[in-house]
């Protein structure tokens, strides 16, 4: 899964909008089997926060062992702590499960900083606040790890929701969601509403608060406002998409759109930040700095290292620009844009000194592995991972943090030519990007 700040926290050519409005295929998505508009039992089934990840409760084994599992659309293994660890309150005890089957195979997953390794097996898995089904799924029982589990995060494992191509040790290990769809009548689709609090939460507040919703098998219309706009999944490995244009406060960054997707652009709930390729990051920061130049920030702030603290209640949201990413649409030469606010890209951080400060870290960072649309982006939107139709949908989240003057937005259509040219073709010799 992508790294830096990656959870587990280890911390163009696109044409200008021409005012030409292309007709949408339909104004409303047709209702499909299993896609009813209400999934009450699944709403509010996530807890957590962007800096440490969002997790869902799952049960593993017989009798069921309850664990909190990080929801990660940037990886494809279901892996759980299976041995004592100082940061784990509980862990999967295979010896207590009558339905556990050992696959007699190990798995080793290194990251830039840290790693986990474990033993592969299968067991019965269900999601108490999910579909009323039990599936036999592959499980990596983590026996050793370094800088993987986070102290105080309250999750004990990771649910990789991406495709088999990036599963470890190889693509023959079926990911959980594939098993779920194969073994049940759950439609091949899930959607995520990640709700940033807009202020720092201490551990007890995280436990008591709602972090959002993972709707398995459908779309819940109460979780978003306006319309859902879809972008094609370019390739089924990560959830790869194509960005065709980037604007800061409506000003085009004017870069070759290939730069935005160099070497890929992915939607990843397991990454905290909006991560941008080096050239794009530098251009974006230059533009954001210029817009907010009335305040003197330390250099470390723009590197995500240094927090800044305004007197509580006086954060000058208005001096920070909105950021718009234009995504390839489903129709030829049509794009749409998603717009986030500083309330998304300035991440609230607890300042131990005093509750009378509002402290933030800059949550846009540099990447050497392409654009990563992490929690910073996802907290603005309801995101539909429509695997059946190979597309990802975005709508304004009903829980996004905003002020009285500006709101996150999903708008379109815009005419954008030659969008296919925005995609970067990774040379075939490339090994997995997991190590980058």
């Amino acid at each position: 899964t992508q790294h830096g700040i990656r959870l587990p926290l280890r911390s163009g050519l696109g044409g200008a909008p021409l005012g030409l409005r292309l007709p949408r295929e339909t104004d409303e998505e047709p209702e499909e089997p299993g896609r009813r508009g209400s999934f009450v039992e699944m709403v509010d089934n996530l807890r957590g926060k962007s800096g440490q990840g969002y997790y869902v409760e799952m049960t593993v084994g017989s009798p069921p062992q309850t664990l909190n599992i990080l929801v990660d659309t940037g990886s494809s293994n279901f892996a759980v702590g299976a041995a004592p660890h100082p940061f784990l309150h509980r862990y999967y005890q295979r010896q207590l499960s009558s339905t556990y089957r050992d696959l007699r195979k190990g798995v080793y997953v290194p990251y830039t900083q840290g790693k986990w390794e474990g033993e592969l097996g299968t067991d019965l898995v269900s999601i108490p606040h999910g579909p009323n089904v039990t599936v036999r799924a592959n499980i990596a029982a983590i026996t050793e790890s370094d800088k993987f589990f986070i102290n105080g995060s309250n999750w004990e494992g990771i649910l990789g929701l991406a495709y088999a191509e990036i599963a470890r040790p190889d693509d023959s290990l079926e990911p959980f969601f594939d098993s779920l769809v194969k073994q049940t009548h759950v439609p091949n689709l899930f959607s995520l509403q990640l709700c940033g609090a807009g202020f720092p939460l201490n551990q007890s507040e995280v436990l008591a608060s709602v972090g959002g919703s993972m709707i398995i098998g459908g779309i819940d219309h109460s979780l978003y406002t306006g319309s859902l706009w879809y972008t094609p999944i370019r390739r089924e490995w990560y959830y790869e998409v194509i960005i065709v244009r980037v604007e800061i406060n409506g000003q085009d960054l004017k870069m070759d759109c290939k730069e935005y997707n160099y070497d890929k652009s992915i939607v990843d709930s397991g990454t905290t930040n909006l991560r941008l390729p080096k050239k794009v990051f530098e251009a974006a920061v230059k533009s954001i700095k210029a817009a907010s130049s009335t305040e003197k920030f330390p250099d470390g702030f723009w590197l995500g290292e240094q927090l800044v603290c305004w007197q509580a209640g006086t954060t000058p949201w208005n001096i920070f620009p909105v950021i718009s990413l234009y995504l390839m649409g489903e129709v030829t030469n049509q794009s749409f844009r998603i717009t986030i606010l500083p309330q998304q890209y300035l991440r609230p951080v607890e300042d131990v000194a005093t509750s009378q400060d509002d402290c933030y870290k800059f949550a846009i960072s540099q990447s050497s592995t392409g654009t990563v649309m992490g929690a910073v982006i996802m907290e603005g939107f309801y995101v539909v991972f429509d695997r059946a139709r190979k597309r990802i949908g975005f709508a304004v989240s009903a829980c996004h943090v905003h002020d009285e003057f500006r709101t996150a937005a999903v708008e379109g259509p815009f005419v954008t030519l030659d969008m296919e040219d925005c995609g970067y073709n990774i040379p075939q010799t490339d090994e997995s990007t997991l190590m980058t």
Partner: antibody
Framework: EVHVKQSGPELKKPGETVTISCKAS????????MTWVRQAPGKDLEWMGW????????IYADDFKGRFAFSLETSAGTAYLQINNLKNEDTATYFC????????????WGQGTSVTVSS | DIVMTQSQKFMSTSVGDRVSVTCKAS??????VAWYQQKPGQSPKLLIY???TRHTGVPDRFTGSGSGTDFTLTISNVQSEDLADYFC?????????FGGGTKLELK
């Protein structure tokens, strides 16, 4: 131009109460917190705490909890420090300062108010 | 509490000299350090914040540097009006603390 002006020197007896005023001008008062710093003879500068001028909530350093109270008269752009039950060791110069916009550095200081406690 | 140590209580200099005042934090404070100048009978004046950012109106002969635990205030081309006490302060961690000061005097 930013100005921070404090009230004049005070001579008090042990057990009495003193109130120091600090009037700020030249900026939006409720945008910047006001901090209090003590400079006692022969001692380092001590951060006493600060008051959020937007919410009115005071924050005290551990050594200044109890007898010390920060307050505001927002409409007048004025902050106050009250010290109750004065002790000899409270003899010092008290400064009010505007806290920095992005952190607790202190960008504009009052001229200081000398408080002498003596029987 | 974080202790800010200014090991040199006094420093002697001459007009036109370059002088460096140092400050050491007892733990990592990032760049959350400010420097103040105080003349006798006056209140302190902010010179530098974020370890290296010059406050409005401060002459460019004053330069701050450092991060983590070691910080330096450098005055190049010392002027007679620079003879004063210099204090460092950390605002990384509650309670915010000051160094004991370094008095700059003429040789």
């Amino acid at each position: 131009e930013v100005h921070v002006k404090q009230s004049g020197p005070e001579l008090k007896k042990p057990g009495e109460t003193v109130t120091i005023s600090c009037k700020a001008s030249g900026y939006t008062f409720t945008t910047y917190g006001m901090t209090w710093v003590r400079q006692a003879p022969g001692k380092d500068l001590e951060w006493m705490g600060w008051i959020n001028t937007h919410s009115g909530v005071p924050i005290y350093a551990d050594d200044f909890k109890g007898r010390f109270a920060f307050s505001l008269e927002t409409s007048a752009g004025t902050a106050y420090l009250q010290i109750n039950n004065l002790k000899n060791e409270d003899t010092a110069t008290y400064f009010c300062t505007r806290r920095g916009r992005l952190g607790h550095y202190f960008d504009y200081w009052g001229q200081g108010t000398s408080v002498t406690v003596s029987s | 509490d974080i202790v800010m140590t200014q090991s040199q209580k006094f420093m002697s200099t001459s007009v036109g000299d370059r002088v460096s005042v140092t400050c050491k934090a007892s733990q990592n404070v990032g760049t959350n350090v400010a420097w103040y100048q105080q003349k006798p009978g006056q209140s302190p004046k902010l010179l530098i914040y974020w370890a290296s950012t010059r406050h409005t109106g401060v002459p460019d002969r004053f330069t701050g540097s450092g991060s983590g635990t070691d910080f330096t205030l450098t005055i190049s081309n010392v002027q007679s009006e620079d003879l004063a006490d210099y204090f460092c302060q950390q605002y990384s961690s509650y309670p915010y603390t000051f160094g004991g000061g370094t008095k700059l005097e003429l040789k």
